[in-house]
């Protein structure tokens, strides 16, 4: 994998001696152009050979409060004829994302960063034949 | 192009807390201190009919400082014979993720939330004809 370095004199945000509590502005900045974010065809989930559905996961004490989670529609993949191909499996592509969770009963507001593993979509992989011992 | 978006209203008015000062909250980021970056499940990237590679970007001003982004290996998909099928397209599945971006004034402990569109993996889709106006 290619590594794109960015040098800086500031301590790395993940260094051992970095602050444990930081101030975060909750106004969300969008580093994507508006055009880019609108250019994600939502129909990939239907046109894919490994189609998926999206399920709403909601938590009012979390930011983002709504997260859409993918689930593969079939165990197998769909071939060119629209039939299930028993040599190919639909598998979920998962991504670890960051969320902010509000600490209970905290005033002023305190949050903690949590990692969450979410299903983003599905891909089609060749079935592995297990070799008997 | 950076577009400021609305903040986190649901989180701002929870409980009987006073309103937030400057939209800022305290965040505990200790979760990162044991674990560099966001991990990516890699077991499907080579077996998929729409295989992909990862590019790792490093940015010390960002939380997480390391992010792996997928890049589809081919424009078409790989068929059962291991050949590229140009009647199908390998497309990147994208996920909007949150990162913490250090505020620009030096090595401060102030951060802002930023949305990023991350390519997580690839899936194989059947192309459709563009409907001309």
């Amino acid at each position: 994998a290619a590594i794109i370095p960015q040098s800086s004199a500031c301590p790395n945000t993940e260094a051992k001696d970095f602050l444990q509590n930081v101030k975060v502005n909750l106004k969300v900045f969008n580093s994507l152009g508006a055009k880019v974010s609108s250019r994600r065809p939502s129909d990939y989930l239907n046109r894919s050979t490994s189609p998926w559905t999206l399920h709403r996961n909601e938590d009012p004490d979390r930011y983002p409060s709504v997260i859409w989670e993918a689930q593969c529609r079939h165990q197998r993949c769909v071939n060119a004829e629209g039939k299930l191909d028993h040599h190919m499996n639909s598998v979920l592509i998962q991504q670890e994302i960051l969320v902010l969770k509000r600490e209970p009963e905290s005033c002023p507001f305190t949050f903690r960063v949590e990692k969450m593993l979410v299903g983003v979509g599905c891909t089609c992989v060749a079935s592995i034949v297990r070799q008997a011992a | 192009r950076k577009n400021p978006k609305a903040g986190v209203p649901a989180l701002q008015k929870a409980g009987n807390c006073p309103p937030l000062e400057d939209n800022t909250v305290r965040v505990d980021i200790r979760i990162f201190n044991q674990n560099q970056g966001i991990s990516v499940p890699r077991e499907f990237q080579n077996r998929s009919s729409s295989p992909w590679d990862y590019n790792i970007t490093r940015d010390p001003h960002r939380f997480p400082s390391e992010i792996a982004e997928a890049q589809c290996r081919h424009s078409g998909c790989i068929n059962a014979q291991g050949q590229e099928d140009s009647t199908m397209n390998s497309v990147a599945i994208q996920q909007e993720i949150l990162v913490l971006r250090r505020e620009p004034q030096g090595c401060s402990n102030s951060f802002r939330l930023e949305k990023m569109l991350l390519k997580v993996g690839c899936t194989c889709v059947k192309p459709i004809v563009h409907q001309a106006a």
């Epitope: 065809p41 | 424009s75 078409g76 590229e84 140009s86 009647t87 889709v125 192309p127 459709i128 563009h130």
Partner: antibody
Framework: EVQLVESGGGLVQPGRSLRLSCAAS????????MHWVRQAPGKGLEWVSG????????GYADSVKGRFTISRDNAKNSLYLQMNSLRAEDTALYYC????????????????WGRGTLVTVSS | EIVLTQSPATLSLSPGERATLSCRAS??????LAWYQQKPGQAPRLLIY???NRATGIPARFSGSGSGTDFTLTISSLEPEDFAVYYC??????????FGGGTKVEIK
Amino acid sequence: EVQLVESGGGLVQPGRSLRLSCAASGFTFDDYAMHWVRQAPGKGLEWVSGINWNSGGIGYADSVKGRFTISRDNAKNSLYLQMNSLRAEDTALYYCARDMGGFGEFYWNFGLWGRGTLVTVSS
Amino acid sequence: EIVLTQSPATLSLSPGERATLSCRASQSVRSYLAWYQQKPGQAPRLLIYDASNRATGIPARFSGSGSGTDFTLTISSLEPEDFAVYYCQQRSNWPPATFGGGTKVEIK
């Protein structure tokens, strides 16, 4: 008016470079994958290279691989072909063509063509 | 690489006659075959895609048929503007845009 206009062709010596441009107008450029197709004088059509809407998918004919580079600038509604190490057999009329795939993906059929720009490689 | 062979190389017909052009693939391209028309000094124009689908604005006298390795473009009744060179193109196998050598339809 929906159109593609190629430019940058001309007479060039073998081994030298040339950069072709294609200006698109009358349609949303980044809704489409784009291609270069060439036609040698008095001959048939040969696909040269293609690029999808966000440059995430790129393909080349074996005859130009490693010598030609396709690129696009969506902000400028422009498609480019950087041609290096030119050979006599690259002499042709170079057409810019729009793919008919939806969402800027490849369909590999060409629904709109420019008038072409002539590249002559000769010493 | 798939080779597309078009026949005949030249077809001499009169306006009003029926034209039948053939395109044969060296291996199956399923139904992923297109037809283009090119007039002298002009760019090609897409007529038919995926063997039998007429492109936008193409008159009904143009029709395509076939699948696998054998394909036909039929012009039911030739108009004066139909005299041109016709190319077939496959998108089934890599490289995904290989063209046939062309058939010239000329006035008899």
